[in-house]
């Protein structure tokens, strides 16, 4: 007997994470034996939607027209074969931002820093959030959270980092969220340039946490150091 | 606790100038705005601006863009306000607040009185 | 800017009773209020934020409501220590704005 059937791929295009009114197609790829494709929502009931393959079959294709709250989820897909259907897909998280008011970031002392000193990017939001995501752009691991203890609310993140390297140079945005769903963020915050100099000869910072040995310079996790925030944040790496 | 110390009453002459002082104490400082508040009999409560202590940031009401100065120090964790030019419409009371993230304002100083008068 | 019409200016009050102050916004402000107390000689203490959210160590008798333009502060079994000027703050906007003030009298 044949062992169970590969697991398809699932991705969404343009991206997972979606602004509030945007259009977003989520694709679902098995093999070419698929005769149906079949795509859950997590804590929906199931199945989400079903769609037929497109030709050549190896694939199906999910559309979402305009981005609301209601899309977004943890999204798993499977596909239909003249021998049952496959294993689940790795899941797929859709973000919509939008939800609620731009946070601010600012850099304290300034967003001009010199290579080994320390700066702290400060997130504040007008309204109590117990979520605060830092993302800088062109990361393969983009989100560091500050997320509230025993459901504690905050106006504000502290993101400290030291040493400063060349690696936390670049543009960065923040966004807040509320506990009960981590899917629906804030509009991010005007971005904010950090600019690194004296760098030339930094040494890369060593990430906590193993990445991909493919991974470029950009590909490693922003590593803010320092002590956790007094305001009864915590941090997470996502 | 959260506490704002503000300097005391101030009697000063039309044209002179005058630094109010807010003592912060009780939480990390530069991580605030500081908001400056003026009270006068009869016309309420006006928000004169902000400073985010850890890099000086400021932002103004436009009413008071030419009259008032803010500065901070993080190593004494005060902040100060200048008023320029006075005259007898800036008698009032005047308060420094810290602000919670952009969002409300939250502690407040005593208030300092100023009296402008020849 | 958003201007903050709070009504009444001045209340006359039993103790033991409820009052409910009123502050109308210009536009829509997204429940960005906050209410607060001021006595005599003091700074005001913040009550109420984000229109309900009662801010740590105020007593629960103390109640904020409201949305788009419309927002109230309610006080209900008032105390001898709740006889004080209250005010609403607006910050939806980059210009925060307050309004006039009530103030509560005993009858």
């Known amino acids: 007997q044949a062992g169970p059937l590969p697991k398809p791929t699932l991705w969404a295009e343009p991206g997972s994470v979606i602004s509030w009114g945007n259009s977003v197609t989520i694709w679902c790829q098995g093999t070419l034996e698929a005769r149906e494709y079949r795509l859950d929502k997590e804590e929906s009931p199931a199945p989400w939607d079903r769609q037929n393959p497109l030709e050549p079959k190896n694939k199906a294709r999910f559309s979402i027209p305009s981005m609301t709250e209601d899309y977004a989820g943890r999204y798993r897909c499977y596909y239909r074969s003249p021998v049952g259907w496959s294993q689940p897909s790795d899941p797929l998280e859709l973000v919509m931002t939008g939800a609620y008011s731009k946070p601010t970031l600012s850099a304290l002392p300034s967003p001009l820093v010199t290579s080994g000193k320390s700066v702290t990017l400060l997130c504040q939001s007008r309204s109590p959030m117990d979520t605060f995501l830092l993302i800088k752009e062109r990361a393969a691991h983009p989100l560091l959270h500050l997320r509230s203890e025993h459901g504690a609310q905050q106006h504000q993140a502290e993101f400290p980092m030291s040493p400063v390297t060349s690696v936390h140079g670049g543009t960065y945005r923040c966004f807040s969220s509320h506990g009960f769903s981590h899917y629906l963020l804030s509009h991010p915050s005007d971005p904010l340039e950090l600019i690194v100099s004296g760098s030339l000869e930094d040494p890369r910072p060593s990430p906590t946490r193993s990445v991909s040995t493919a991974a470029g310079p950009e590909d490693q996790p922003l590593m803010p150091t320092g002590s956790v925030p007094h305001s009864g944040l915590r941090r997470h790496w996502e | 606790q959260v506490q704002l110390q503000q300097s005391g009453a101030e009697l000063m002459k039309p044209g002179a100038s005058v630094k109010i002082s807010c003592k912060a104490t009780g939480y990390t400082f530069r991580t605030y705005w500081i908001e400056w508040v003026k009270q006068r009999p009869g016309h309420g409560l006006e928000w004169i601006g902000e400073?985010?202590?850890?890099?000086?940031?400021?932002h103004f009401n436009e009413n008071f863009k030419d009259k008032a100065t803010f500065t901070a120090d993080t190593s004494s964790n005060a902040a100060y306000m200048q008023l320029s030019s006075l005259t007898s419409e800036d008698s009032a009371v005047y308060y420094c607040?810290?602000?919670?993230?952009?969002?409300?304002?939250?502690?407040w100083g005593q208030g300092t009185t100023l009296t402008v008068s020849s | 800017d958003i201007q903050m019409t709070q009504s009444p200016s001045s209340l006359s009050v039993s103790l033991g009773g409820k009052v409910t102050i009123t502050c109308k916004a210009s536009?829509?402000?997204?429940?960005?209020i906050g209410w607060y107390q001021r006595k005599p000689g003091k700074g005001p203490r913040l009550l109420i934020h984000?229109?309900?959210t009662l801010q740590s160590g105020i007593p629960s008798r103390f109640s904020g409501s409201g949305s788009g333009r419309d927002y109230s502060l309610s006080i209900s079994n008032l105390e001898p220590e709740d006889i004080a000027t209250y005010y609403c703050?607006?910050?939806?906007?980059?210009?925060?704005?307050f309004g006039g003030g009530t103030k509560l009298e005993i009858k």
């Open positions: 703050l607006q910050y939806a906007n980059p210009l925060p704005t």
């Open positions: 536009q829509d402000i997204n429940e960005y």
């Open positions: 400073i985010l202590p850890g890099n000086g940031n400021t």
């Open positions: 607040v810290r602000r919670l993230g952009r969002g409300p304002f939250d502690f």
């Open positions: 984000y229109t309900s």
